[in-house]
Amino acid sequence: SEVEYRAEVGQNAYLPCFYTPAAPGNLVPVCWGKGACPVFECGNVVLRTDERDVNYWTSRYWLNGDFRKGDVSLTIENVTLADSGIYCCRIQIPGIMNDEKFNLKLVIKPAKVTPAPTRQRDFTAAFPRMLTTRGHGPAETQTLGSLPDINLTQISTLANELRDSRLANDLRDSGATIRIG
């Protein structure tokens, strides 16, 4: 039961994936692929990093965050309905079976005819760094977690946002937890 992310046609989609480098600049190869993570590789690769840099990418797919600090979240530019589906983020940690595999489901919705009210803004747009997946593979469940740099004020703000959010039920159903610290 992979975590679901949403975007509208014509918008940019954001698929979160993070790791913590052992030391600054000590990067780990990461690949993003369209389709669920296979046993060793990344499916149909759309972007790949090595120990130093992004060494392969395709149009519309890019890393908006600081990948040198472990933010390897994928941005897909100007999405269409064809971009819907499962995406694989694979963090290729050296060693024996150390890979972290994340399957993320992207749902693309038709563009709204009228803009949504301000309070109904997209959760992932309002709090893009709050959505992160924890390690899993086939037949494992994912949970949502938070990064350690979120303070109590942000948590309170987040709770207010969630109260009216379209995603509140989705987060509850996927076993979301907000961790402080």
Epitope: V28, P29, V30, C31, G33, G35, A36, P38, V39, F40, E41, C42, G43, N44, V45, I86, R90, Q92, I93, P94, G95, I96, M97, N98, D99, N103, P138
Partner: antibody, heavy 119, light 111 residues
Framework: EVQLVESGGGLVQPGGSLRLSCAAS????????MSWVRQAPGKGLEWVAA???????YFPDSVKGRFTISRDNAKNSCYLQMNSLRAEDTAVYYC?????????????WGQGTLVTVSS | DIVLTQSPATLSVSPGERATLSCRAS??????????MQWYQQKPGQAPRLLIY???NVESGVPARFSGSGSGTDFTLTISSLQSEDFAVYYC?????????FGGGTKVEIK
């Protein structure tokens, strides 16, 4: 044309070590997972090691702690270091290329190299 | 580990006849709608050759008389009309989980 050529097999005593090499050509080696699969005389196939394009390592319990796999993308080569060899490790060892984007099955194989563990 | 059981161990078939080989997995190899099962052919003194991947996809260059089917735990390799070059040992293999595992093989021999 894709080619995989194994070398390094031979006769070794129980407890000994051996290093097998696989020289690859005809494809962009760094993009593919590579595996070693063995076949004991008159027996079936057994997967023994894999290394992903990113360098992650995978082994079955039967060889974990005794075998290790490595790759040198600059030399288009993959290696299987076998330590603490046992009689039951006697087999033909094949180097195999994992299918691109997956790695978990094998679209090209080498001709194999025979490893005999005997005193 | 996922155990693959192939049957029969030996299949005696006349040239031109149809051959049906079975592979049963100890647990499902379905993953996001794909069956992670492959079939290989091996002739004496040769390396294995990939025939079928993801249960039913025929590898490039493999004759159309080879086909694969099945899902979940039960899979079948069918050779519609056996040719002399098809007499060999056939192995199934799962790529669902590490360790990757092979079936024990089915030997297809001339009747």
């Amino acid at each position: 044309e894709v080619q995989l050529v194994e070398s390094g097999g031979g006769l070794v005593q129980p407890g000994g070590s051996l290093r097998l090499s696989c020289a690859a050509s005809g494809f962009t080696f760094s993009r593919y997972a590579m595996s070693w699969v063995r076949q004991a005389p008159g027996k079936g196939l057994e997967w023994v090691a894999a290394i992903s394009s990113g360098g992650s390592l995978y082994f079955p319990d039967s060889v974990k702690g005794r075998f290790t796999i490595s790759r040198d993308n600059a030399k288009n080569s993959c290696y299987l270091q076998m330590n603490s060899l046992r009689a039951e490790d006697t087999a033909v060892y094949y180097c195999a290329r994992g299918r691109e984007a997956d790695g978990g099955y094998f679209d090209y194989w080498g001709q194999g190299t025979l490893v005999t563990v005997s005193s | 580990d996922i155990v693959l059981t192939q049957s029969p161990a030996t299949l005696s078939v006349s040239p031109g006849e149809r051959a049906t080989l079975s592979c049963r997995a100890s647990e499902s190899v379905e993953y996001y709608g794909t069956s992670l099962m492959q079939w290989y052919q091996q002739k004496p003194g040769q390396a294995p050759r990939l025939l079928i991947y993801a249960a039913s996809n025929v590898e490039s260059g493999v004759p159309a008389r080879f086909s694969g089917s099945g899902s979940g735990t039960d899979f079948t390799l069918t050779i519609s009309s056996l040719q002399s070059e098809d007499f060999a040992v056939y192995y199934c293999q799962q790529s669902m989980k590490v360790p990757l595992t092979f079936g024990g093989g089915t030997k297809v021999e001339i009747k």
